[in-house]
């Protein structure tokens, strides 16, 4: 099938980095500047992606592969192939319709991206709050309140103090 295809379609012989030029008897012409073809047999070359503004060039365009972009400092990539650049916020904030805003009470964000999430509800697991939550950190859950009742402590009691003047046996 490949042989018959190449006999019927001279374009199939055009390698990546070229295109099959209908205006020149279907000969293989190199992709013009700022364009590429990543596969053989193409009738056109694709325009190279341009990394402008908040997008920075991570990899230059070549005749056989598109440019790749990342984001300028203070922004992070979103989407496949860094299709978007989104502003970083501080920990304890989220990006809203009006920019970076502090997390509401009862929520936190420990990253420079993403949304504020509710603190863990320790009581759902039958535990108590060991360390309070902040805008930047989730609460830390500790043992259940029952575990902390008198006589039920799991903490090892300190060794009894020796009387003065007694040396270890």
């Amino acid at each position: 099938f490949e042989r018959t295809r190449s006999l019927q379609d001279p374009c199939s012989n055009c390698p990546a980095g070229t295109f099959c030029d209908n205006n020149r008897n279907q000969i293989c012409s190199p992709c013009p500047p700022n364009s590429f073809s990543s596969a053989g047999g193409q009738r056109t070359c694709d325009i190279c992606r341009q990394c402008k503004g908040v997008f920075r060039t991570r990899k230059e365009c070549s005749s056989t592969s598109n440019a790749e972009c990342d984001c300028t400092p203070g922004f992070h990539c979103l989407g496949a192939g860094c299709s978007m650049c989104e502003q970083d916020c501080k920990q304890g904030q989220e990006l809203t319709k009006k920019g970076c805003k502090d997390c509401c009470f009862g929520t936190f964000n420990d990253q420079k991206r993403g949304i504020c999430r509710p603190w863990t509800n320790c009581s759902l697991d039958g535990k108590s709050v060991l360390v309070n939550g902040t805008k930047e950190r989730d609460v830390v859950c500790g043992p259940s309140p029952a575990d902390l009742s008198p006589g039920a402590s799991s903490v090892t009691p300190p060794a009894p103090a020796r009387e003065p003047g007694h040396s270890p046996q």
Partner: nanobody
Framework: EVDLVESGGGLVQPGGSLRLSCAAS????????MSWARQVPGKGFEWVAY???????YYADSVKGRFTISRDNAKDTVYLHMNSLKFEDMAVYYC????????????????WGQGTQVTVSS
Amino acid sequence: EVDLVESGGGLVQPGGSLRLSCAASGFTFRSYAMSWARQVPGKGFEWVAYIYSDGSTYYADSVKGRFTISRDNAKDTVYLHMNSLKFEDMAVYYCATWRSQQVGRWDEYDHWGQGTQVTVSS
């Protein structure tokens, strides 16, 4: 071909004013939300102001009350009126389309101008 050309930058004293313009061509300007962003050397980009196709606006806290973004759909131009300029406003200012319409976010199909320098100096 899409083109955005900024103008109006220059040298101004603290407390002074400037009006930046961004002339657009190659797309249906009135249908697009537009943005101004700035880049301070060594500090990266920050968004400054946005204007929707219907004329509603958003401003960064750092420029609120001092800067005004506006658009003239008949002239395919977006403006940034800058008053009470401060030393910290010194930057290269860029005009860009704003397809995502999410503050602080641009996508790969947005178009950017070449930028215009604003220098604040006494």
